[in-house]
Amino acid sequence: KESCDVQLYIKRQSEHSILAGDPFELECPVKYCANRPHVTWCKLNGTTCVKLEDRQTSWKEEKNISFFILHFEPVLPNDNGSYRCSANFQSNLIESHSTTLYVTDVKSASERPSKDEMASRPWLLYRHHHHHHHHHH
């Protein structure tokens, strides 16, 4: 049953809450068999995904999986939003689900909402910070 299709392992509704000013690595886990595909990141603007051309990216290779990483050095408030990775392989374009970054601005960190407030007010754009932690609702 082992398929040699390229797979991008970003789950639907995946989210990260991060703090402005911190470094952050957004990972796109990629499975491929022989030739590594060309992978890019884009940021969603409405229904359009705008390719991130001049951002620092890197590959991390592990035994059964590779990661195409988008680096935030550091995270800025306007990095808030949804991102998608795409792989080009043998003329096929494979797109991942989007993953959302919720950026808390350090300037308002002292006024950040509590966990309880967050639970009762999920519409808040800026989330309480848990570095590298995934939130799912």
């Epitope: 049953k1 797979q7 989007s98």
Partner: antibody, heavy 121, light 112 residues
Framework: QITLKESGPTLVKPTQTLTLTCTFS??????????VSWIRQPPGKALEWLAH???????RFNPSLKSRLTITKDTSKNQVVLTMTNMDPVDTATYYC?????????????WGQGTLVTVSS | DVVMTQSPLSLPVTLGQPASISCKST???????????LNWLQQRPGQSPRSLIY???KLDSGVPDRFSGSGSGTDFTLKISRVEAEDVGVYYC?????????FGQGTKVEIK
């Protein structure tokens, strides 16, 4: 060979908590893309998805039952456990666990044999 | 929730003849990633479900090629080109595009 097998009580009383275990072999739940779901089927009725746990311990629940459900995994034992609180006779069903494989998204490619749970006093 | 509606609910078929089952969803199953997460299961009498087709038309391993899937958006079809005795059972479509994942009510295929 991939197999999944459900185990747990066949009879529970109303208001009690149901604990079901899915023991699987032939794959690892730590592998990217892998997951396990619980799905139930009341007698003579259609299937209803309950909960899913992913390779990285991320979880998803059916919102209509979320407050009653927990799902956990023990990768070393190849087990996934579902608990459902406050059982009611309408929860009488065959409960299946299924492997979630991945092709851009989860699909269920292997199913357990199912275990019939009756809720009655 | 996305409601999946199958028709017919009962399908008497003649051995060796084709059969077709329709599945309609209340929302488009085309995902923003460009894929359509519509799947089909077979449940033979007294057995647990078995995966037949995923991503609208991909046959799962070990599934005979007399089965095929087609469709897009909200309208999907499962076809059996020549029904065999072992095809008797209930067929379910289900969607994995929107949470919660939801199933059709099932179509019972029986031999005339």
């Amino acid at each position: 060979q991939i197999t999944l097998k459900e185990s747990g009580p066949t009879l529970v009383k109303p208001t009690q908590t149901l604990t079901l275990t899915c023991t699987f072999s032939g794959f690892s739940l730590s592998t990217f893309g892998m997951g396990v779901s619980w799905i139930r089927q009341p007698p003579g009725k259609a299937l209803e998805w309950l909960a899913h746990i992913y390779w990285d311990d991320d979880k998803r629940f059916n919102p209509s039952l979320k407050s009653r459900l927990t799902i956990t995994k023990d990768t070393s034992k190849n087990q996934v456990v579902l608990t459902m609180t406050n059982m009611d006779p309408v929860d009488t069903a065959t409960y299946y666990c299924a492997r979630g494989n991945w092709d851009g998204e989860t699909y269920f490619d292997y199913w357990g044999q199912g275990t019939l749970v009756t809720v009655s006093s | 929730d996305v409601v999946m509606t199958q028709s017919p609910l009962s399908l008497p078929v003649t051995l060796g003849q084709p059969a077709s089952i329709s599945c309609k969803s209340t929302q488009s199953l085309l995902d923003s990633d460009g894929k359509t997460y519509l799947n089909w299961l077979q449940q033979r009498p007294g057995q647990s479900p078995r995966s037949l087709i995923y991503l609208v038309s991909k046959l799962d391993s070990g599934v005979p090629d007399r089965f095929s899937g087609s469709g897009s958006g909200t309208d999907f079809t499962l076809k059996i080109s020549r029904v065999e005795a072992e095809d008797v059972g209930v067929y379910y479509c289900w969607q994995g595009t929107h949470f919660p994942w939801t199933f059709g009510q099932g179509t019972k295929v029986e031999i005339k």
